[in-house]
């Protein structure tokens, strides 16, 4: 599919001008290559009319130009003094006309309306309000006032001052007669429909002395704004419908076949299942404007979107609307990353978040998508050192591995952690990605004691048991704080006896705190990593108390105080609820499961030929 995108249809009137914008992926090659506008012939082929290399056809001499905007990935063709001869099928494209890097555009130039003399033209957007003003003379002040619409050869009464309203206008029209000083009456029509367009006649009086005024009402269907976004990226629709609909339900819908427009989200709480976890509707402002952001863009998200206002929360005739045509560029600069990460209760997940590598200094954020009402995304952690209070000790955002990816580690997982999370930065707004955390059956791989109490001035040793599957991994202990997890020295104590069916490659690695002080109180993590890629983690809270009896403390799994959420294993070891991060590259032996949503997307993992948008969890 060609990554070039532009307007499918352009409509104008003789004598007017048009401006046509075409989008392309802003790669270095594309920015500098030839841009063209050509007219398609009846027998195929496409005759160049204008190009970025300076060529202008004689047909366009003095009335057209083509401007490239390489920083935006767009070029614009302006054509003036349009005639009906300009109607036809065109292409805007890159490179050579016949190469296929192009987009088809239909240009329709119509004759201007033939209007009667003294006709006032009203041009109003669909769904809006028009006020048709009708002057009259003093002698007709007490006589009947009326508005007619010309249907074919005959005028049809729309409304009059005696109370008649044409059924097509019921509930959305009124006739106002100004105060005695002003010789004017007005007809106000709300919620304008396309069918309201046409020639109107207003009249005061019914005899030969009546006053008449012609009006031409043009109802404009909104031209869709073109939106060009990358696959896996995000799009924001800003919808400004005006203060008159501030208190009316708002919606965003996507046009399907024909005139149908399927609700994507509305302020009445409806949300299409395909957008679960990846859409937010900003609460509307007092002026009636609102915004919708969609992340994790898919190929099938491309299409025409309408936002509007109607009490039903969906498109109805007469809804004021705004339109967008969304093109999803499959030649995306946003790398594939797992859209699903799996972890077990008590275990951990490591989530990789892509960001624009040109913005390494940007602040990184991670928020939890909440589906209630219009959706919210409360922040959980950021790269400046803020962590939501309820996540203290079990959540960390790391700048590693860097170069376009940061890592979020969440441990002590429970079923409540299942859900959708968004990776954000304060930089490029297009790089917002969504990941779903699923909690699956299984046991955590790392085994640590429950909460541990250390004694002031004494030595504390805390064990962490690593199964043999992690034999090739770097094992570490660190002390958690709100800016990360500071590495601490640890000792390899040899093979662990905590695992059944696990050979000499299992490991017991201990953290030793000498001469414990109050400052040692807090959360400690043990974990595995390979280079800058983090695997599972397990967390232990170390409390510090006054000395009761001399000596050092060597905490075993079985001896540590059991916390309410812990379960004592048959082997005599206890597992605490903990959480860890995982990178698909880390687990060669854990076959990834394909996410059916995007079979075409391979995995970031280089260790496994199996494709996956899902990322394996703590254990299988």
């Amino acid at each position: 599919k060609s990554p070039i995108f532009g307007p499918e249809e352009v409509n104008s009137v003789e004598g007017n001008s048009v401006s046509i914008t075409c989008y392309y992926p802003p790669t270095s090659v594309n920015r500098h290559t030839r841009k063209y506008w050509c007219r398609q012939g009846a027998r195929g082929g496409c005759i160049t009319l204008i190009s970025s290399e300076g060529y202008v056809s004689s047909k366009y001499a003095g009335r057209a130009n083509l401007t490239n905007f390489p920083e935006n990935g767009t070029f614009v063709v302006n054509i003036a003094q349009l005639s009906q001869d300009d109607s036809g099928r065109y292409k805007c494209g890159l490179g050579i006309n016949s190469r296929g890097l192009s987009f088809d555009v239909s240009l329709e130039v119509s004759q201007g309306p033939g209007l009667l003399n003294d006709t006032k033209v009203y041009t109003v957007d669909l769904g809006r309000t028009v006020t048709i003003n009708c002057p009259f003379k003093t002698e007709n002040a007490q006589k009947r006032k009326s508005l007619y619409k010309q249907i074919g050869l005959y005028p049809v009464l729309v409304i009059d001052s005696s109370g008649y309203v044409n059924p097509n206008y019921t509930g959305r029209i009124r006739l106002d007669i100004q105060g005695t000083g002003q010789l004017l009456f007005s007809v106000v029509i709300n919620q304008l429909r396309l069918s309201d367009a046409g020639q109107y006649l207003c009249q005061a009086g019914d005899d030969s002395n009546s006053n008449k005024k012609n009006a031409d009402l043009q109802v404009l269907k909104p031209e869709p704004e073109l939106v060009y976004e990358d696959l896996r990226g995000s799009v924001t629709f800003h919808c400004a419908l005006g203060p008159e609909v501030a208190n009316v339900a708002k919606f965003l819908c996507r046009q399907s076949s024909g005139e149908n427009c399927d609700v994507v989200v509305n302020t009445l709480g409806k949300r299409a299942p395909a957008f679960e976890g990846r859409i937010l509707l900003n609460p509307q402002d007092k002026d009636g404007s609102f915004s919708v952001v969609i992340t994790g863009l898919r190929k099938e998200d491309a299409g025409r979107y309408l936002c509007g206002a109607h009490s039903d929360g969906q498109l109805q005739e007469g809804s004021p609307i705004q339109a967008w045509q969304l093109f999803v560029n499959e030649e995306s600069t946003i790398p594939r990353s797992p859209t699903v990460v799996k972890g077990v209760a008590g275990g951990s997940v490591a989530v990789l978040c892509p960001y624009n590598r040109k913005e390494s200094k940007s602040i990184k954020y991670w928020c939890l998508w909440e589906g209630a009402q219009n959706g919210r995304c409360p922040l959980l952690v950021d790269s400046e050192g803020w962590v939501k209070a309820q996540y203290e000790g079990r959540l960390s955002l790391l700048e590693e591995p860097g170069n376009g990816t940061f890592t979020v580690i969440l441990n002590q997982l429970t079923s409540r952690d299942a859900g959708f999370y968004w990776c954000l930065t304060n930089g490029d707004t297009l790089w917002r990605t969504t990941v779903e955390i699923k909690i699956i059956e299984g046991e955590p791989n790392l085994k640590v004691p429950g909460n541990v109490t250390a004694v002031l001035g004494e030595t504390l040793k805390v064990p962490c048991h690593f199964p043999c599957k992690f034999s090739s991994y770097e094992k570490y202990w660190c002390k958690w704080n709100n800016t990360g997890c500071q590495a601490l020295p640890s000792q390899d104590e040899g093979p662990s006896k905590a695992f059944v069916n696990c050979d000499e490659n299992s490991r017991l690695v201990s953290l030793t705190l000498n001469l414990v002080t109050r400052a040692d109180e807090g959360w400690y993590w043990c974990g595995v990593k390979q280079g800058h890629f983090y695997g599972e983690t397990a967390a232990v809270y170390v409390a510090v108390e006054e000395r009761k009896a001399a000596g050092s403390r060597d905490v075993s799994l079985a001896k540590a105080d059991a916390a309410p959420d812990e379960k004592v294993l048959d082997s005599g070891f206890r597992e605490i609820e903990n959480k860890a991060i995982q990178d698909p590259r880390l687990f060669a032996e854990e076959k990834a499961v394909a996410d059916t949503r995007d079979q075409a997307d391979g995995s970031r993992a280089s260790v496994d030929s199996g494709s996956s948008e899902e990322q394996g969890g703590s254990s299988r």
Epitope: T236, H238, L280, L281, N282, S291, V292, V293, Y365, C367, R376, C377, P378, L379, D382, E384, G385, W386, V387, K388, A389, Q390, E392, W422, L424, N426, N482
Partner: nanobody
Framework: EVQLVESGGGLVQAGGSLRLSCAAS????????MGWFRQAPGKEREFVAA????????YYADSVKGRFTISRDNAKNTVYLQMNSLKPEDTAVYYC??????????????????????????WGQGTLVTVSS
Amino acid sequence: EVQLVESGGGLVQAGGSLRLSCAASGRTFTSYTMGWFRQAPGKEREFVAAIKWNGGSTYYADSVKGRFTISRDNAKNTVYLQMNSLKPEDTAVYYCAADGDPYFSPTDGIVWHAPHQSEYDYWGQGTLVTVSS
């Protein structure tokens, strides 16, 4: 759980100054945006000022901009409101509040403070400020 205790209120003449303090208990003080609200007799409680967790951003009601300054000392778990050029209409009970729920907004990016009192999780008992003319 965070407990908040305000102090520093009192009677002051118009044009004078006061400094309010709010001491917070609990390990997680740095997780909260801290705010000051006030309630004048017979009126609704209104937003006065707020400060991001690290002091990096501050927010003020239009009525106090340029006169009031909010600050915080995370080492002491305390937030302050320095009130200068006081006016009789500043007379009210001043409440300290903690908001632990910054959020992402499609239009505004990360919102660290919400001027709506419903967004705040914890409240102090209040301290009375009376400005006489």
